[in-house]
Interface confidence: low
């Protein structure tokens, strides 16, 4: 599918919160959304409110995921399931790459070779059938402020 | 076991309409993401069509889109394929197959086929 | 969409290995673990062989083998028997959520 207009990223430093984003994956065209109840998925309707992210660098190169709404941050579980937890944990944490392509990449800190992704079905996909070169894995930040 | 039965296929006339069904049996089929793949006789295989274990997203191959429609009835564990405006080009043979889990592009449980013969 | 490259025959005797190559794109082989094999033996459906590349459905013999260097996939058969004798193609996902496959590549046993 067409990329949907206004991407933009790009590192920030340490503990700086930047504005709300939509992180658009280019598997299918699905938002990244966090539920309340903490599952993680994808929807492709931009005006859910569960797609509001708040990205927070812990340090260059790694922030953390937290769904405005649902007010938890996106975790890699150690069997590869992507769920939302109340509180920040080592598990919440995920390199942020800029690729050629102009798309990130968020890989898990805890589990280094596991991606956030999303299959072309809007579910998530298992960290443990992620890679490097896959098109789930890739994400385009987009503003949320509207 | 673990089954694909196509049904539906014949003969119709360039610019006809025929509607191919697959029911599956032994497996749980509301579980699976599901496709359509043909075999002109004598040719190679081609992806026709993917719709998700839900049904809410939908592919085509460029050769289909706008003539072919692909449902699925997760209560009677079938799936279906409306072809339109049907071109000689389409006479083949069509599989349903099953995708495997957590994949893309892997079909592990196919049909047998059905006959699709467009001619005047 | 386009189809993956592969040779139109191959033949090896009973005993032996044979190598059949998929050339595609970045757009598809290239650019994603996805590639599969499938088996056809003549009049019936196919047969999932190799997935991700590399990976063997249960009940495939290990015989069978897959790999892939840029955007060239190869199938590897080893101690080839009278019952591989077939038709194989090659498959792909590729960057437009479709899969494609190439034209097979017909195996002789001598």
């Known amino acids: 599918p067409a990329l949907p207009e206004d991407g933009g990223s790009g590192a920030f430093p340490p503990g700086h919160f930047k504005d709300p984003k939509r992180l658009y994956c280019k598997n299918g065209g699905f938002f990244l959304r966090i539920h309340p109840d903490g599952r993680v998925d994808g929807v492709r309707e931009k005006s859910d409110p569960h797609i509001k992210l708040q990205l927070q660098a812990e340090e260059r190169g790694v922030v953390s995921i937290k769904g405005v709404c649902a007010n938890r941050y996106l975790a890699m579980k150690e069997d590869g399931r992507l769920l939302a937890s109340k509180c920040v944990t080592d598990e919440c944490f995920f390199f942020e790459r800029l690729e050629s392509n102009n798309y990130n990449t968020y890989r898990s800190r805890k589990y280094t070779s596991w991606y956030v992704a999303l299959k072309r079905t809007g579910q998530y996909k298992l960290g443990s059938k992620t890679g490097p070169g896959q098109k789930a894995i890739l994400f385009l930040p987009m503003s949320a402020k509207s | 076991q673990v089954q694909l039965q196509e049904s539906g296929g014949g003969l119709v006339q360039p610019g006809g309409s025929l509607r191919l069904s697959c029911a599956a049996s032994?497996?749980?089929?509301?579980?699976?993401?599901m496709n359509w793949v043909r075999q002109a006789p004598g040719k190679c295989l081609e992806w026709v069509s993917y719709i998700s274990s839900s049904g809410s997203t939908i592919y085509y191959a460029d050769s289909v889109k706008g003539r072919f429609t692909i449902s699925r009835d997760n209560a009677k564990n079938s799936l279906y394929l409306q072809m339109n405006s049907l071109r000689a080009e389409d006479t083949a043979v069509y599989y349903c197959?099953?995708?495997?889990?957590?994949?893309?592009?892997?079909?592990?449980?196919w049909g047998q086929g059905t006959m699709v013969t467009v001619s005047s | 969409q386009s189809v993956l490259t592969q040779p139109a025959s191959v033949s090896g005797s009973p005993g032996q290995s044979i190598t059949i190559s998929c050339t595609g794109t970045?757009?598809?082989?290239?650019?994603?673990?996805?590639v599969s094999w499938y088996q056809q033996h003549p009049g019936k459906a196919p047969k999932l062989m190799i997935y991700?590349?590399?990976n063997r459905p249960s009940g495939v013999s290990n015989r069978f083998s897959g790999s892939k260097s840029g955007n060239t996939a190869s199938l590897t058969i080893s101690g080839l028997q009278a019952e591989d004798e077939a038709d194989y193609y090659c498959?792909?996902?590729?960057?437009?959520?479709?899969?494609?496959f190439g034209c097979g590549t017909k195996l002789t046993v001598l």
């Open positions: 032994g497996f749980t089929f509301s579980s699976y993401e």
């Open positions: 991700d590349v590399s």
């Open positions: 970045s757009s598809d082989v290239g650019g994603y673990n996805y």
């Open positions: 498959s792909s996902y590729t960057s437009s959520s479709t899969v494609v």
């Open positions: 197959a099953r995708e495997l889990t957590g994949d893309w592009g892997a079909f592990d449980i």
